[in-house]
């Protein structure tokens, strides 16, 4: 058992039927000695009496919020919550495996740009009763400071007969240096609460594998006189890393006709122009990626030919 | 050519050069950016390897106070690397597809550390740890690693040396 | 006690379908996860497919994936395996069990045989 | 998947004989995610240790489990005529989870 926060412990069971659970000791916080009882979440039911609980944590009919009273007057209280270990595996209940870009990924980050800023998301099926906490540090064994903002529902979406919720967070290294070469991977924690159930996910990534720019911005066409060629230009995205002589970007341009089936005619340049033949009812879509590190493309920023 | 004493180095050609060492890190191991090798302990092997750290003047402010400093950190990598490419990690079993791309690495690497520093001119290198790995598959884990690292490492270094040609080339 | 018995076994020829049950008593079924293994007669054990608590994870083993489905139905205490495109080599006994790979708690088991 | 071997393929002793079963595994099985069942004739299997040496509610303690990584052993101290069965070893470290191929403990 462990505090996950004041009042709040974390029982670790191994997970079977018939299993043993755990002897757990609940301590009442006052400086009384006598008339004390103890009651489970709404239950007016007396558990036992003393400044001590003894119980066997089995199931999920032993968690919950455990009281302390005497006289009709409150004292303290612990919320015992469950960790489930089935098999030697920690329990994923409350989060969807992504399976990208393998399969048990449960959280899923990106950033826009080297300044230590990032964003990551998760997905589940679960509606109510459910709580994020997000840690973040730089290494793991001698930990630098990210700090990352409250989880927030950032998208809902119907899957079949599920509805499916989108939860991210925002972190920010505390002392980014975005030119250097990272050796402490970034580690990231979320702590998951639904009901009486707890889990914790993990995430280690460095920055750099995690890159994913902005599309490119501005994107124009210009025509050539007496051609069907025409000359594509944009800028780099606002969010890109800056100065862009360092922190350069590569781009693909690509002609798509009207048909998915038609042939892709594309270009790669790590200039912001091209020349491209403009065909009919085609469009022409620009996406950029790390000039230096084979990190995520963009997404397309599109234009019609016409 | 960056000498000791302070000149500046080539800088278009280092960049050209260094763009040319990016593309042979990926392609030597394409895949290995699908692989999560730190979940394979990491420990003894790759924790050595020189790494350009926040405070080398690798920076677009530090290359503008004085580059020596980033590029003698640089220096130090590119031979690291070289030696690293030309140990028995990779001569050894298993061997290496004749046209594997680490050879065309290996000389791009020595290319550019020349270019750095001309004979008769000596920053001091550090040392590369005796890493003799004695199972196949073991060598071939290695192989990713450095091959990994090294895509990190020639990453900066090459935005070092374009913003350089950009900027700083006289 | 922990209780487990599998129905739905039977014979049946190559590409056809059968529906295998099990049903649970005894604990909180809705709690655990659930597993199916088989035993090819005069053979060892091979591990088939298993479902989480919730039914919201499943897993299977390469040879019947694509072809078999696990289900489970916590309001009745049930698990399930539906098998499809039934080929020769799945000619067993199929047990239920509980755990995700660990089986700790087995039914007694319901024979499929493949032939035509 | 890892390849789960067992040696003898069988095993002829008498009762109150020391038996002892081994198993090797492919490649390494974390944090020794290992298991041992038993099997009698007609009837289903029956887990006797998991984490390659914690014995199963109810398991007599002449069953014992040892090894770790690749190599794992089942030792019965001294056997009772219940004893003789097959004996399946099982690895869940890595998924797919697999068994071995058995040894059959018979009497002499």
């Known amino acids: 058992i462990w505090e996950l926060k004041k009042d709040v412990y974390v029982v670790e069971l191994d997970w079977y039927p018939d299993a043993p659970g755990e002897m757990v000791v609940l301590t009442c916080d006052t400086p009384e000695e006598d008339g004390i009882t103890w009651t489970l979440d709404q239950s007016s039911e007396v558990l036992g009496s003393g400044k001590t609980l003894t119980i066997q944590v089995k199931e999920f009919g032993d968690a919950g919020q455990y009281t302390c009273h005497k006289g009709g007057e409150v004292l303290s209280h612990s919320l015992l919550l469950l960790h489930k270990k089935e098999d030697g595996i920690w329990s994923t209940d409350i989060l969807k495996d992504q399976k990208e870009p393998k399969n048990k990924t449960f959280l899923r980050c990106e950033a826009k740009n080297y300044s230590g800023r990032f964003t990551c998301w998760w997905l589940t099926t679960i509606s109510t009763d459910l709580t994020f906490s997000v840690k973040s540090s730089r290494g793991s064994s001698d930990p630098q400071g990210v700090t990352c903002g409250a989880a927030t529902l950032s998208a809902e979406r119907v899957r079949g007969d599920n509805k499916e919720y989108e939860y991210s967070v925002e972190c920010q290294e505390d002392s980014a240096c975005p030119a250097a070469e990272e050796s402490l991977p970034i580690e990231v924690m979320v702590d998951a609460v639904h009901k009486l159930k707890y889990e914790n996910y993990t995430s280690s990534f460095f920055i750099r594998d995690i890159i994913k720019p902005d599309p490119p911005k501005n994107l124009q066409l210009k025509p050539l006189k007496n051609s069907r060629q025409v000359e594509v230009s944009w800028e780099y995205p606002d969010t890109w890393s800056t100065p862009h002589s360092y922190f350069s970007l590569t781009f693909c341009v690509q002609v798509q006709g009207k048909s998915k089936r038609e042939k892709k005619d594309r270009v790669f340049t790590d200039k912001t122009s091209a020349t491209v033949i403009c065909r009919k009812n085609a469009s022409i879509s620009v996406r950029a990626q790390d000039r230096y590190y084979s990190s995520s493309w963009s997404e397309w920023a599109s234009v019609p030919c016409s | 050519r960056a000498v000791p004493g302070g000149s500046s180095p080539a800088w278009t050609q280092c960049q050209q050069l260094s763009q040319k060492l990016c593309t042979l890190a990926w392609s030597a191991h394409p895949l290995v950016g699908h692989m999560d090798l730190r979940e394979e302990g990491d420990e003894e092997t790759t924790n050595d390897v020189p790494h350009i750290q926040c405070g080398d003047g690798c920076d677009p402010q530090g290359l503008r106070d004085n580059s020596q400093f980033c590029l003698q950190r640089i220096h130090q990598g590119l031979i690291f690397y070289e030696k690293l490419l030309g140990s028995d990690i990779f001569t050894g079993e298993p061997s290496l597809l004749p046209d594997s791309p680490v050879g065309q690495l290996h000389a791009s690497l020595l290319g550019l550390s020349q270019l750095l520093q001309p004979e008769g001119h000596h920053w001091e290198t550090q040392q590369i740890p005796s890493l003799s790995p004695s199972q196949p598959w073991q060598r071939l884990l290695l192989r990713f690693k450095i091959l990994r690292s090294l895509q990190a490492f020639v990453a900066v270094a090459a935005r070092v040396f374009a913003h350089g040609a950009a900027t700083l080339s006289p | 006690e922990v209780q487990l018995l599998e129905s739905g076994g039977g014979l049946v020829q190559p590409g056809g379908s059968l529906r295998l049950s099990c049903a649970a008593s005894?604990?909180?079924?809705?709690?655990?996860?659930m597993s199916w293994v088989r035993q090819a007669p005069g053979k060892g054990l091979e591990w088939v497919s298993s479902?989480?608590?919730?039914?919201?994870?499943?897993d299977y083993a390469d040879s019947v994936k694509g072809r078999f489905t696990i289900s489970r139905d916590n309001s009745k205490n049930t698990l399930y395996l539906q098998m499809n495109s039934l080929r020769a080599e799945d000619t067993a006994v199929y047990y239920c069990?509980?755990?995700?790979?660990?089986?700790?708690?087995w039914g007694q088991g319901t024979l499929v045989t493949v032939s035509s | 998947d890892i390849q789960m071997t067992q040696s003898p393929g069988t095993l002829s002793l008498s009762p109150g004989d020391r038996a002892t079963l081994s198993c090797r595994a492919s490649?390494?099985?974390?944090?020794?995610?290992l298991a041992w069942y038993q099997q009698k004739p007609g009837q289903a299997p029956r887990l006797l240790i998991f984490?390659?040496?914690t014995r199963a509610t109810g398991i007599p303690d002449r069953f014992s489990g040892s090894g770790s990584a690749t190599d794992f052993t089942l030792t019965i101290s001294s056997l009772e005529p219940e004893d003789f069965a097959v004996y399946y070893c099982?690895?869940?470290?890595?998924?797919?989870?697999?068994f071995g191929p058995g040894t059959k403990v018979d009497i002499k």
């Open positions: 069990a509980t755990g995700i790979a660990v089986a700790r708690y």
């Open positions: 005894g604990f909180t079924f809705s709690n655990y996860s």
């Open positions: 479902i989480r608590s919730s039914g919201g994870r499943t």
């Open positions: 490649q390494s099985v974390g944090s020794d995610y």
């Open positions: 984490a390659a040496s």
């Open positions: 099982q690895q869940y470290g890595s998924s797919p989870a697999t």
